[in-house]
């Protein structure tokens, strides 16, 4: 058992048929020494009586608020949550596996530049009594802060029978040096809780790795005088770190036609512009990534070849 | 359910500080998350800032971010609002509510919340 929050309790218990539990010993916050009953929950069943209540914690139903008073009055509270491990594995019951890059993500973060600003998501289908509190840090044996807002609601999908629910957090190093080579990685770590189970989720990652550009902005098509061919022009994303001659983008142009299966003519630049052939129904697409380290590429922005 | 009762309010100079209380009758106070809401006259009911029951984060309006505070103590059922630097947009009616279920997206949304105080009057002069 270990303190959550002042109050706030997580039994870690091993999940499997006719597990014997953890025996929990909880202790009224008072100087009172007689007269003190225990309860639990709503229920005004006494649980037992004294400074200390001893409960054996096998299942969810022995979790909860567990309250001590005397004479009517509440002297303090104790909220047992549990934390199931399974065949010695933690459980991930509320968030679900993203499967992306690989196997066992529950978190994916990204960041549109190198400033210590980053954003991670997650999934679950669970729609009530959750709760999400998210913490960062750039190392962990001597850690350096990071700040995160609060977990929101960023997205609502219906899968199947299902609705899925996306959540996201926005965090910012404190003291982040873009220009810096990154020797320690960001930590961020989310505690979840749904009803009377807890569970906790990290990931790990450098910066670098986690970049994804903002799509090239102001998109543009110049005809070139008697010729098939346009000149492409585009500029860096305004989130993108600068200067832009040290956080350098490289660029691919597609030029894609009406039907899928057409085939798609690709020029790859570090300029800001190119020039290629402007099909009929066609159309135009740039997308951005760090020139130097092969991170994400940025999602496409596109315009019609008209 | 839960019984709300603020208390705290009155009538202070701009740049002045209040502390308001709002205290629960009820025995899972704990397992609440507790917000305070502000409703000036003629306009919406406005979220102020909550305390997230089992972590205890406390989120808050921009409006009020870095004046006000909020913490609570569980023993004595009770959830404060502490405003400093006062200003007299600051003036309305504040009110306590509390909720058993919601997730971490909805606390500023006031459909979140099931138990409500009849509020307390804050008057910020000029």
């Known amino acids: 058992i270990w303190e959550l929050k002042k109050d706030v309790y997580v039994v870690e218990l091993d999940w499997y048929p006719d597990a014997p539990g953890e025996m929990v010993v909880l202790t009224c916050d008072t100087p009172e020494e007689d007269g003190i009953t225990w309860t639990l929950d709503q229920s005004s069943e006494v649980l037992g009586s004294g400074k200390t209540l001893t409960i054996q914690v096998k299942e969810f139903g022995d979790a909860g608020q567990y309250t001590c008073h005397k004479g009517g009055e509440v002297l303090s509270h104790s909220l047992l949550l549990l934390h199931k491990k399974e065949d010695g594995i933690w459980s991930t019951d509320i968030l679900k596996d993203q499967k992306e890059p690989k196997n066992k993500t529950f978190l994916r973060c990204e960041a549109k530049n190198y400033s210590g600003r980053f954003t991670c998501w997650w999934l679950t289908t669970i729609s009530t009594d959750l709760t999400f509190s998210v913490k960062s840090s750039r190392g962990s044996s001597d850690p350096q802060g990071v700040t995160c807002g609060a977990a929101t609601l960023s997205a609502e999908r219906v899968r199947g029978d299902n609705k899925e629910y996306e959540y996201s957090v926005e965090c910012q190093e404190d003291s982040a040096c873009p220009a810096a080579e990154e020797s320690l990685p960001i930590e961020v770590m989310v505690d979840a809780v749904h009803k009377l189970k807890y569970e906790n989720y990290t990931s790990s990652f450098f910066i670098r790795d986690i970049i994804k550009p903002d799509p090239p902005k102001n998109l543009q098509l110049k005809p070139l005088k008697n010729s098939r061919q346009v000149e492409v022009s585009w500029e860096y994303p305004d989130t993108w770190s600068t200067p832009h001659s040290y956080f350098s983008l490289t660029f691919c142009v597609q030029v894609q036609g009406k039907s899928k299966r057409e085939k798609k003519d690709r020029v790859f630049t570090d300029k800001t512009s190119a020039t290629v052939i402007c099909r009929k129904n066609a159309s135009i697409s740039v997308r951005a990534q760090d020139r130097y380290y092969s991170s994400s590429w940025s999602e496409w922005a596109s315009v019609p070849c008209s | 359910e839960v019984q709300l009762v603020e208390s705290g309010g009155g009538l202070v100079q701009a740049g002045d500080s209040l502390r308001l209380s709002c205290t629960a009758s009820?025995?899972?106070?704990?397992?609440?998350?507790m917000a305070w809401f502000r409703q000036a006259p003629g306009k919406e009911r406005e979220f102020v800032g909550t305390i997230v029951r089992i972590f205890g984060d406390t989120y808050y309006a921009d409006s009020v971010k870095g004046r006000f505070t909020i913490s609570r103590d569980n023993a004595k059922n009770t959830v404060y609002l502490q405003m400093n630097s006062l200003k007299p947009e600051d003036t309305a009616v504040y009110y306590c509510?509390?909720?058993?279920?919601?997730?971490?997206?909805?606390?500023?949304?006031?459909?979140?919340?099931?138990?409500w105080g009849q509020g307390t009057q804050v008057t910020v002069s000029s």
């Open positions: 509510a509390a909720a058993l279920r919601g997730t971490s997206s909805d606390w500023r949304a006031a459909a979140t919340y099931d138990d």
């Open positions: 009820g025995r899972t106070f704990s397992s609440h998350t």
